[in-house]
Interface confidence: medium
């Protein structure tokens, strides 16, 4: 699985989408989990409704919500009031029995807004950080994400 980056601004909401094959995953509940270390387990944060037919109902665990469009094949996770400690590697999962299939690996990055003059603490300020070392993110990213040769945005 490649890793998809989703960036959010500290203090704001971030929506993460995980598309999937609705037929292949028909009848399956979904979950959002946080990867603990590069090879560690994925700790469940929140899962969809116990009744699959009610998966469209938004379920919350703290500041994280999950909802599933089972017909369209899109799982949506909302992280409310994004904080630096929310940065890291996550997975969208499709559950079947005691097993879980990974739908998408997600790297959540939390950026400070330097224009917001409230106490920014140790947030990552865009334009200043030169590497992940300065940012509060996990390093377990797939090769495709690290393609150094991908140019920034040829601009026109």
């Amino acid at each position: 699985h490649n890793t998809t980056v989703f960036q959010g601004v500290a203090g704001q909401s971030l929506q993460v989408s995980c598309p999937y094959d609705s037929m292949k995953h028909w009848g399956r509940r979904k979950a959002w989990c946080r990867q603990l270390g590069e090879k560690g387990p994925c700790q469940r944060v929140v899962s969809t409704h116990n009744l699959w037919l009610l998966s469209f109902l938004r379920r919350w665990n703290g500041s994280t919500a999950i909802t599933d469009d089972t017909l369209g094949g899109t799982l949506t996770i909302t992280l409310r009031n994004l904080q630096p400690h929310d940065a890291g590697l996550y997975q969208c999962q499709s559950l079947h029995g005691s097993e879980a299939d990974t739908l998408r690996k997600v790297l959540v990055e939390v950026l400070a807004d330097p224009l917001d003059h409230r106490d920014a603490g140790d947030l990552w300020f865009p334009g200043e950080s030169e590497s992940f070392e300065d940012a509060h993110v996990e390093h377990s990213i797939s090769r495709s994400l690290l393609e150094g040769e991908i140019p920034f945005p040829p601009t026109s």
Epitope: V5, F6, Q7, Q15, G127, S129, E130, F152, P153
Partner: nanobody
């Protein structure tokens, strides 16, 4: 970046920045500017996805508007009521793979 040029005080310009090579809609985007002999200054920021979150430097608030079109991988800066002190090279920026990435910039000159 494109859309810069020479404009009279009180005039308007719309800057555009086309991006490629990454999942544009997932990234926070910024417009910076750099005037001669001055440090680069963050002018505006827009959140990822729908770009509902925006914020502006005090010096441009109420005059500049940042927006994005995720379908076209574009970010825009609408600049109204321009002042001579807005003269600078304007850059769009994204923090990608942990590093800030800059375009070549577009010159905006406000003069009568």
């Amino acid at each position: 970046e494109s859309g810069g040029g020479l404009v009279q005080p009180g005039g308007s310009l719309r800057l555009s920045c086309a991006a490629s090579g990454f999942a544009f809609s997932n990234y926070v985007m910024h417009w910076y500017r750099q005037a001669p002999e001055k440090e680069r200054e963050l002018v505006a920021i827009i959140g990822s996805q729908g770009g509902a979150y925006t914020n502006y430097a005090a010096s441009v608030k109420g005059r500049f508007t940042i927006s994005r079109d995720n379908a076209k991988n574009m970010v825009y800066l609408q600049m109204n009521n321009l002042k001579p002190e807005d003269t600078a090279v304007y850059y769009c920026n994204v923090v990608y793979i942990g590093r800030p990435n800059w375009g070549q910039g577009t010159q905006v000159t406000v003069s009568s």
